[in-house]
Interface confidence: low
């Protein structure tokens, strides 16, 4: 929540439209990896500000007479991790008045992401040839989940799912045997998280 | 030429109230964070409140509710209303701007000195 | 009782190398920059070294920062007798700026 202080002036948002907010190469990266956060307005602008709400680390400015400021993180570390924003300005707006500020964006800077759950459903004990369904869940959108089978070198299946978490169905005559996921970010550099636990399925 | 002029320091009784401004020239007083510092007789400095750009102000625990910082950009100006005083509350108070990247304060104020006694 | 810990004193004599110390933990120091602040007796702060181990334009480059894990240091080499001063380390963590209680260096002889 981004609450101006005072004398700081945030116009209607049909005044000075909000400008976008962008991650390269991802908004998910190991340590160390060089990120370019991209703020690009609906209109040349003069300034363009990147700050991180609810925080008091000071802000970065770009003085540029276009569209677009890139904001280079280099070698980024988990502490620079968070919530980021980005503003613009004209000089012709007079002091203090900046644009809106763009949606958020979450970037995340981690060697391993938070392991995931792996549930069946209805449940783990399923009738002779019954299908069943498996859902591996992480805490993240946007993922490659893969789904693993114990004694089977290769991965199962794979999904690519824009929430947070992906189904795999498994064949009611196959389905018996033990199980764990994970998930990973879908393009280089590539973030894996920790294995799930192990989740056994037997007939009943 | 960037300077930092702090005035609004003198004599108050306990439990009085005292309002300091620090006024700014040489930049674009808006676009920065202003934060307010404080010292006591022989002691170390101590961070008192900040302004951001965007957002709510930050304060130390020790000053929350007692102490507002404010800013006025059209007057290049930063305040801090100061409530409550107690003797402890003697210091030199700076105004110091910080830096566009890496949590540092670039530029201080000379400081103007509160006194709390009866 | 300041969060980042500072020697309260450190001393040496003109030329000598002398190094200044300043703990803190994981929510600070750990994740975040620190910077170092020189106070000379009856002046204002002044800004020694920004981001660990940047120096501003105008600070001589005997003074150098250094960070590894929770703890920053601060050199002086070439000691001269005008480097007789507090200096304070700082840092912040999410919801406050955090400053070490100081050192008094002493220029001996």
């Known amino acids: 929540d981004i609450t101006p202080s005072v004398a700081i002036i945030v116009p209607p948002a049909s005044y000075h439209p909000k400008p976008w907010l962008g991650a390269q190469p991802a908004t998910v990266v190991t340590p160390g990896v060089n990120v370019t956060l991209r703020c690009r307005a609906p209109q040349p602008a003069w300034r363009f500000g990147l700050f991180k709400p609810g925080e008091i680390a000071p802000l970065l400015f770009r003085d540029v007479s276009s569209e677009l400021a890139e904001f280079f993180l280099e070698e980024v570390t988990p502490a620079q991790g968070g919530s980021y924003r980005c503003c613009y300005r004209r000089p012709d707006w007079g002091p203090g008045v900046w644009s809106q500020p763009s949606d958020v964006l979450e970037l995340l800077v981690t060697e391993e992401l938070p392991r995931p759950s792996l549930v069946a459903l209805p449940g783990p004990v399923v009738g002779p040839g019954a299908n069943v369904s498996l859902r591996c869940a992480g805490r993240l959108r946007n993922m490659s989940f893969v789904l693993y089978r114990e004694g089977v070198a290769a991965p199962l299946q794979y999904r690519h799912s824009a929430q947070p978490w992906a189904d795999f169905t498994l064949l009611g005559a196959r389905a018996p045997g033990t199980y764990s996921c994970y998930y990973h970010t879908p393009s280089a550099p590539y973030v894996l998280s920790q294995r799930s636990e192990v989740l056994v399925i037997s007939w009943e | 030429e960037v300077q930092l002029l702090e005035s609004g320091g003198g004599l108050v009784q306990p439990g009085g109230s005292l309002r300091l401004s620090c006024a700014a020239s040489g930049f674009t007083f808006s676009d920065y964070y202003w934060t307010w510092v404080r010292q006591a007789p022989g002691k170390g400095l101590e961070w008192v409140s900040g302004s951001p750009v965007f957002g709510a102000a930050n304060y130390a625990q020790n000053f929350q509710g007692r102490f507002t910082i404010s800013r006025d950009n059209s007057k290049n100006t930063l305040y801090l209303q100061m409530n409550s005083l107690r003797a402890e509350d003697t210091a030199v108070y700076y105004c110091?701007?910080?830096?566009?990247?890496?949590?540092?304060?670039?530029?201080w104020g000379q400081g103007t000195l509160v006194t709390v006694s009866s | 009782q300041s969060v980042l810990t500072q020697p309260p004193s450190a001393s040496g004599t003109p030329g000598q190398r002398v190094t200044i110390s300043c703990s803190g933990s994981s929510s600070n120091i750990g994740n975040n920059y620190v910077s170092w602040y020189q106070q000379l007796p009856g002046t204002a702060p002044k800004l020694l070294i920004y981001?660990?181990?940047n120096r501003p334009s105008g600070v001589p480059n005997r003074f150098s920062g250094s960070k590894s894990g929770t703890s920053a240091s601060l050199a002086i080499s070439g000691l001269r007798s005008e480097d007789e001063a507090d200096y304070y380390c700082q840092s912040y963590d999410s919801s406050s700026w955090l400053f070490g209680g100081g050192t008094k260096l002493t220029v001996l002889g």
């Open positions: 110091a701007k910080a830096g566009f990247t890496g949590g540092h304060f670039d530029i």
């Open positions: 981001g660990n181990s």
